[in-house]
């Protein structure tokens, strides 16, 4: 399977909400011995290898934000911790998974990474990630609403095995 990032750049005004999205593509094994671990984290834009370092989102680690389920099942993060920080990650039946961030501040700007780990019990793991940038802006140059920039077809299916 692959992870697609429909948008490579989100530009949002301060105070707005945004939902960053990744999509699981390709054949997904729905067997009982397969589960999917999905999560989000930030990574420094200065890194040579994109998404190689896992940094927190609003003080929450990738462990705090993870979803764990089988196949294309729907799932949401535990509400208490994430929602206290204005965050919610979710996954639907169609392979889409997202993180919603409320009341954006400039400090939310940066590179966001979605990670999917296919776990086959008693076998190996398969890891793929997608990356997108969020720029939060303020002042006269800031848009009135979030503006999204589509990934090129090559970028949108760009995957890296971890």
């Amino acid at each position: 399977f692959k992870v697609a990032t429909p948008y490579s750049l989100y530009v949002c005004p301060e105070g707005q909400n945004v939902t960053l999205t990744c999509r699981l593509l390709g054949p997904v094994d729905k067997g009982h011995d397969v589960t999917f671990y999905k999560t989000w984290y930030r990574s420094s834009r200065g890194e040579v290898q994109t998404c190689s370092e896992r940094r927190p989102i609003r003080n929450l680690t990738f462990q705090d934000l993870h979803l764990h389920h089988g196949g294309h099942q729907a799932a949401n993060t535990s509400h208490d911790l994430a929602q206290r920080h204005g965050l919610e990650s979710a996954s639907d039946h169609h392979g889409n998974f997202s993180i919603t961030m409320r009341n954006l501040t400039l400090l939310d700007s940066g590179l966001y990474c979605c990670l999917v780990v296919e776990i086959r019990h008693h076998h190996s793991e398969h890891r793929v990630h997608g990356a997108m940038e969020l720029q939060v802006q303020t002042g006269k140059d800031a848009p009135s609403n979030c503006v999204v920039y589509p990934s090129s077809s090559q970028d949108s299916e760009n995957i890296t095995a971890a």
Partner: antibody
Framework: QVQLQESGPGLVKPSETLSLTCAVS?????????WTWIRQPPGKGLEWIGY???????SYNPSLKGRVTISVDTSKNQFSLKLSSVTAADTAVYYC????????????WGQGTTVTVSS | AIQLTQSPSSLSASVGDRVTITCSAS?????IHWYQQKPGKAPKLLIY???KLASGVPSRFSGSGSGTDFTLTISSLQPEDFATYYC?????????FGQGTKLEIK
Amino acid sequence: QVQLQESGPGLVKPSETLSLTCAVSGYSITSDYAWTWIRQPPGKGLEWIGYMMYSGSASYNPSLKGRVTISVDTSKNQFSLKLSSVTAADTAVYYCARFDHYYGRFDYWGQGTTVTVSS
Amino acid sequence: AIQLTQSPSSLSASVGDRVTITCSASSSVSYIHWYQQKPGKAPKLLIYEISKLASGVPSRFSGSGSGTDFTLTISSLQPEDFATYYCQQWNYPLFTFGQGTKLEIK
């Protein structure tokens, strides 16, 4: 190694505008992080003035009542502070620093420059 | 905004002493960082994320705590450790500094 270096006049007259520049080497300020100004009045603690994100937007300490502007010169890899309508209360050592906004820490600092507001 | 209170505000100690500085937050915080500032110098990151030593910091420095109460400990004071120490909290999206603790030679 990331290095920051402040420069600017050490003496500013009351009601005038204080202008300082921070030159950064070893890292591109448009790559990542928040680039900040912090000051320390004589014998006192540290006060955050404001920061500019790598993407160009800035945020300021509300206590400075709109007197602050932080701007960037990407061609020289430096960012600047302007503080208008200064008074003796703005006398301080001014530091520029890199703010790691992932973990909320100031990981690299300039050596500081002393600015005295006096006629 | 979360307030940080350091205690003591000043402290006299001798070389070889074990010293503890505390930092209390007015409500729970995610991260605490500690800085050391010597006279005429910029602050230097000493300990980050409560207990991690910054690059080049000697192992005699340690940090601990959680929630609202945090400590910086120097296990055996060296002459170069006499300085002012600041704690700083990070609770997205705000940060604040403590008022500082001045460590002087007895």
